[in-house]
C-alpha cells in the first residue's frame, strides 16, 4: 500500500520550503526591527585617537558613552583585536578622519 497518495512527496517538499520561507521571513523581520532600533554612530569629541590602548566605545542608556579599555600591559596576556592587524601597537579611535586600522607612533 502506497505511503501516500500521488503527489504527496511534492506536497512535503512544498510545505518544507514554505516552512523555510516563513523562518527566513521571521529572521528578516527580526533583523529589520533590530536595525531600526540601532542609533547612528555618535561622533567623538575628537577627530583622532586620544587613547593609547585598545578601545571599545559602546553607547549606554540615554546615549551616555561608556569606555571599555583593553590595555596591552604585561603581565596580562595580550589579546588580539579580531582582524585589526594591529598587534601590540597603539591604536587610534576609528573615525572618519583617522581611517581604519593602526597608527604607529611617528618619531621626529
Amino acid at each position: 500500500h502506497p505511503l501516500g497518495s500521488p503527489g504527496s512527496a511534492s506536497d512535503l517538499e512544498t510545505s518544507g520550503l514554505q516552512e523555510q520561507r516563513n523562518h527566513l521571513q521571521g529572521k528578516l523581520s527580526e533583523l529589520q526591527v533590530e536595525q531600526t532600533s540601532l542609533e547612528p554612530l555618535q561622533e567623538s569629541p575628537h577627530p583622532t585617537g586620544v587613547w593609547k590602548s585598545r578601545e571599545v566605545a559602546t553607547e549606554g542608556i540615554r546615549g551616555h558613552r561608556k569606555m571599555v579599555l583593553y590595555t596591552l600591559r604585561a603581565p596580562r596576556s595580550p589579546k588580539m583585536v579580531q582582524g585589526s592587524g594591529c598587534f601590540g601597537r597603539k591604536m587610534d579611535r576609528i573615525s572618519s578622519s583617522s581611517g581604519l586600522g593602526c597608527k604607529v607612533l611617528r618619531r621626529h
Epitope: Q42, E43, S44, P45, H46, P47, T48, G49, V50, W51, K52, S53, R65, M67, L69, T71, D92, S96, S97, L105, R107
Partner: antibody, heavy 119, light 106 residues
C-alpha cells in the same frame, strides 16, 4: 593664512547672557572641529565646548546648562553664549580651530577676548 | 577629573627642566603640552605624549610612564620662562587641562 578672531562685549552685567562670536578666515568651517576655551585670570585654561565636523556639540558637563554653541558656515562664524553670568565667568575667551585634543597637532587659537562680569 | 602639576619649577640656564603631570587615566590616555607666555594664547609643544608639531624646537620633548607624563626642556633659555599646561581627556573624552606650572630660568 588661518586666522580666528573673537568678538563681543568686554563688559557684561551679572545675570545677563554673554554672547561671543568667532570669525574665521583662511579655512572653511565645513568639516572642521571648532572649540571654545576660556581662562580666568591667573588660572588654567578650561575647555567649554566643541562642535564636531558632523555638527554634534559637546559641552563641559559642569557648565552645560548655561552654554550654547552655534555655527554659521556661510558667514565663517561660530558663536558661544553663556547665560546667567557671574563674576566667576570673568575670563579670556578663546576660539580654537580643532577639538583641543591630546591626540593631534592641529590647534590654531584666536588671540582671545577678555570678558569682565561686573555690575 | 584632575591633572596635577607642580605650581612652579626652577632651572638653571642651559640645564634641563622637567615638568610632571599626574592623572588617573594617563596610563590609557594621551597627553599634550602647551606653553603660554604672558598676553598670548597657549601654544602646543607636544601631543600624543611625545610627538612634536612642526616648528617646535627639539629642545622640547615629552615622555609618559604609568599615570605620570613629563615635559622635558633641555638647555633651558630665558625665553622658555612661561606657564606650561598639560592636557588630556576624562573618561568621556572631554578635554581637561592641568593645573599649570610656572617655569623660572635662573
Amino acid at each position: 593664512q588661518v586666522r580666528l578672531q573673537e568678538s563681543g562685549p568686554s563688559l557684561v552685567k551679572p545675570s545677563q547672557t554673554l554672547s561671543l562670536t568667532c570669525t574665521v578666515s583662511g579655512f572653511s568651517l565645513i568639516g572642521e572641529y571648532v572649540t571654545w576655551v576660556r581662562q580666568a585670570p591667573g588660572k588654567a585654561p578650561e575647555w567649554l565646548s566643541t562642535m564636531a565636523s558632523g555638527g554634534t556639540i559637546f559641552y563641559n558637563p559642569t557648565l552645560k546648562a548655561r552654554l550654547s554653541i552655534t555655527k554659521d558656515s556661510t558667514k565663517s562664524q561660530f558663536s558661544l553664549s553663556v547665560s546667567s553670568v557671574t563674576s566667576e565667568d570673568t575670563a579670556m575667551y578663546y576660539c580654537v580651530r580643532s577639538s583641543v585634543s591630546p591626540g593631534d597637532d592641529r590647534d590654531v587659537w584666536g588671540r582671545g577676548l577678555l570678558v569682565t562680569v561686573s555690575s | 577629573y584632575e591633572l596635577t602639576q607642580p605650581t612652579s619649577v626652577s632651572v638653571a640656564l642651559e640645564q634641563t627642566a622637567e615638568i610632571t603631570c599626574q592623572g588617573d587615566l594617563l596610563d590609557d590616555a594621551y597627553v599634550a603640552w602647551y606653553q603660554q607666555k604672558p598676553g598670548q594664547a597657549p601654544m602646543k609643544l607636544i601631543y600624543k605624549d611625545s610627538e612634536r608639531p612642526s616648528g617646535i624646537l627639539d629642545r622640547f620633548s615629552g615622555s609618559s610612564s604609568g599615570k605620570i607624563a613629563t615635559l622635558i626642556i633641555s638647555g633651558a633659555r630665558t625665553e622658555d620662562e612661561a606657564d606650561y599646561y598639560c592636557l588630556s581627556v576624562d573618561s568621556s573624552e572631554y578635554s581637561v587641562f592641568g593645573s599649570g606650572t610656572r617655569l623660572t630660568v635662573l
